[in-house]
Interface confidence: medium
């Protein structure tokens, strides 16, 4: 339904508070370097303008598109060229090219200072002094660091952030109450950002068909009792929501997400028996809850899959009549029967099925040709199962930190050209698959592990895309979305890599390491490990373990010393010399 004024329509639908929050998120995700105060000023101007349009939809400029209105506003920033360089050229373009230009300049790794958490009393004072500004600052800081964060979900995070401060700033022990909640929000926020980043990459790099296939598989696993037509409707709506959010259309996205939640709750009887509790919650909680809802039970007595997709003489006829619908039905039927498979595995099976039909439906005897198609699935299913079994065994043997180190070595040898911070970040996250998924029973391990790995490897892909240094990474990232993980798993040691020159400075440590948190200290040690492998890619596991054990002992010894700095200087030289000898550096 067409509205005379799109901005008035969204303002009325969302309400002033959500409207302002979403515009702030949108602006911060586009202009990631702009000061907070500048963004607040722009948001207030847009809000005042929106109010004039609500009062009179025929008022001047109220008929303009949101992209035009927001783009015009962003292009008024005085320091655009000095701060953003060539992004300023976007302002010379017309819509829709201007918005596309802004989107292309979103930076997944902006050069922003690390967020340092102030003392609890300082935060509580700031919260009480000006709650509105405090919460806006949260939205701003998260949005600019995570330019693809799912905006309506960020509103949900902000609501929880506010609730944490409201409760804990009155508590007897403010820190004990607040800090665990903030840690949880930080960790959940990073995970949410990474999951959404994969959805946007899927849409932007591989197209709508790829995203829809992913959504069919996931929703069919989650709602196995729903009819195919119902799943298809949900997929269409969900695709629209994520296309909008990934495209910077945050007001439309939040509005459509609310509509989708409403539809799901109104039709839960034909969707899933697990939605009841979610649907009793307020909007933001409801949408979050639906997105995380557990899989419904599989219907009893599902008919034979083979009958329609292998044994039927009409397979080629049905396929030719509507290829994507037939493949969608195959994916739906397979996924609803297999909550134990990862979504990416289901998509690989559907791709194999499609390839077989393409070949067989042109053959002399199509039925004879595709009769054994399920046999082709066997190696595809075995591969992730075996990989997960081996890696969970390794994780259980080593524990998370040492498991991360094993992955650091493995991935540095595969792609040594990738920057050390990226290798550390990605390998640490890959290593978290152990504690996240290995505790699950067999039936839940693969969907947990492989779909999580897809999210983490996408982080590698988007960070590498910004500064490409490895053809092997580019190849694994761009050839096939569903085969990224098998592609990286299959990479062996890069024999073409010329080892990095030894630089003693890289391995020089100071007393400041002693005051770091356990996590930060681990990152320091893991950074050294990556550099070690880059210098000596042929080093054995045993050699690297010996050097790392020596390094850990060195840090422990010097942190206990009276004169820490002297200890680090003197013992550090000895350690470097011993390591060089051990590794032949």
């Amino acid at each position: 339904d067409a509205h005379k004024s799109e901005v008035a329509h969204r303002f009325k639908d969302l309400g002033e508070e959500n409207f302002k929050a979403l515009v702030l998120i949108a602006f911060a995700q586009y202009l990631q370097q702009c000061p907070f105060e500048d963004h607040v000023k722009l948001v207030n101007e847009v809000t005042e303008f929106a109010k004039t349009c609500v009062a009179d939809e025929s008022a001047e400029n109220c008929d303009k598109s949101l992209h035009t209105l927001f783009g015009d506003k962003l292009c008024t920033v005085a320091t655009l060229r000095e701060t953003y360089g060539e992004m300023a050229d976007c302002c010379a373009k017309q819509e829709p090219e201007r918005n596309e230009c802004f989107l292309q300049h979103k930076d997944d790794n902006p050069n922003l200072p690390r967020l340092v958490r102030p003392e609890v009393d300082v935060m509580c004072t700031a919260f009480h002094d000006n709650e509105e500004t405090f919460l806006k600052k949260y939205l701003y800081e998260i949005a600019r660091r995570h330019p693809y964060f799912y905006a309506p979900e960020l509103l949900f995070f902000a609501k929880r952030y506010k609730a944490a401060f409201t409760e804990c700033c009155q508590a007897a022990d403010k820190a004990a109450c607040l800090l665990p909640k903030l840690d949880e929000l930080r960790d959940e926020g990073k995970a949410s950002s990474a999951k959404q980043r994969l959805k946007c990459a899927s849409l932007q790099k591989f197209g709508e068909r790829a995203f829809k296939a992913w959504a069919v598989a996931r929703l069919s696993q989650r709602f196995p009792k729903a009819e195919f037509a119902e799943v298809s409707k949900l997929v269409t709506d969900l695709t629209k929501v994520h296309t909008e959010c990934c495209h910077g259309d945050l007001l439309e996205c939040a509005d459509d997400r609310a509509d989708l939640a409403k539809y799901i709750c109104e039709n839960q009887d034909s969707i899933s028996s697990k939605l009841k509790e979610c649907c009793e919650k307020p909007l933001l909680e409801k949408s979050h809850c639906i997105a995380e809802v557990e899989n419904d039970e599989m219907p009893a007595d599902l008919p034979s899959l083979a009958a329609d997709f292998v044994e039927s003489k009409d397979v080629c006829k049905n396929y030719a009549e509507a290829k994507d619908v037939f493949l969608g039905m195959f994916l739906y039927e397979y996924a609803r029967r297999h909550p134990d498979y990862s979504v990416v595995l289901l998509l690989r099976l559907a791709k194999t099925y499609e390839t077989t039909l393409e070949k067989c439906c042109a053959a002399a005897d199509p039925h004879e040709c595709y009769a054994k198609v399920f046999d082709e699935f066997k190696p595809l299913v075995e591969e992730p199962q075996n990989l997960i079994k081996q890696n969970c065994e390794l994780f259980e043997q080593l524990g998370e930190y040492k498991f991360q180190n094993a992955l650091l070595v493995r991935y540095t040898k595969k792609v040594p050209q990738v920057s050390t911070p990226t290798l550390v970040e990605v390998s640490r996250n890959l290593g978290k698959v152990g504690s996240k998924c290995c505790k699950h029973p067999e039936a839940k391990r693969m969907p947990c592990a492989e779909d999580y790995l897809s999210v983490v490897l996408n982080q590698l892909c988007v960070l590498h895309e910004k500064t490409p240094v490895s053809d092997r990474v580019t190849k694994c990232c761009t050839e096939s979305l569903v085969n990224r993980r098998p592609c990286f798993s299959a990479l062996e040691v890069d024999e073409t890599y010329v080892p990095k020159e030894f630089n003693a400075e890289t391995f020089t440590f100071h007393a400041d390491i002693c005051t770091l948190s356990e996590k930060e200290r681990q990152i320091k040690k893991q950074t050294a490990l990556v550099e070690l492998v880059k210098h000596k890619p042929k080093a054995t596991k045993e050699q690297l373990k010996a050097v790392m054990d020596d390094f850990a002992a060195f840090v422990e010894k010097c942190c206990k010393a009276d004169d820490k700095e002297t200890c680090f200087a003197e013992e550090g030289k000895k350690l470097v010399a011993a390591s060089q000898a051990a590794l032949g550096l």
């Epitope: 034979s304 044994e311 498979y341 399920f374 075995e382």
Partner: nanobody, 123 residues
Framework: QVQLQESGGGLVQPGGSLRLSCAAS????????IAWFRQAPGKDLEGVSC????????NYADSVKGRFTISRDNAKNTVYLQMNKLKPEETAVYYC????????????????WGQGTQVTVSS
């Protein structure tokens, strides 16, 4: 080599129970759907029940629903058919058969078959 071996058949009174086992050797059942068929003297082969490789999807002939239960233990490489409230007309040779991943609609689509085990329901 690849083999399926049924066991657990025998003579049982009407209303009684039996538990049939289908053990695989030479291959792992993890990637196979297992079906039970039966053939009464002078009758056609009839599908009784099937369980997909994941164990999630199970199918039963209308005549046995609520009385028969199919289950699998992949660690033991074995599939079971628990038969309760047996009727005289269910006297037959019971066979198990395997096909990759999913249950099939036709007996001819199964790749591997056992030799069968005799079930006799009589007083």
């Amino acid at each position: 080599q690849v083999q399926l071996q049924e066991s657990g058949g025998g003579l049982v009174q009407p209303g009684g129970s039996l538990r049939l086992s289908c053990a695989a050797s030479g291959f792992t059942l993890d990637y196979y759907a297992i079906a039970w068929f039966r053939q009464a003297p002078g009758k056609d082969l009839e599908g009784v029940s099937c369980i997909a490789s994941s164990g999630g999807a199970t199918n039963y002939a209308d005549s046995v629903k609520g009385r028969f239960t199919i289950s699998r233990d992949n660690a033991k490489n074995t599939v079971y058919l628990q038969m309760n409230k047996l009727k005289p007309e269910e006297t037959a040779v019971y066979y198990c058969a395997a096909a990759t991943f999913e249950c099939r609609g036709r007996s001819s689509s199964y790749d591997y078959w056992g030799q069968g085990t005799q079930v006799t329901v009589s007083s």
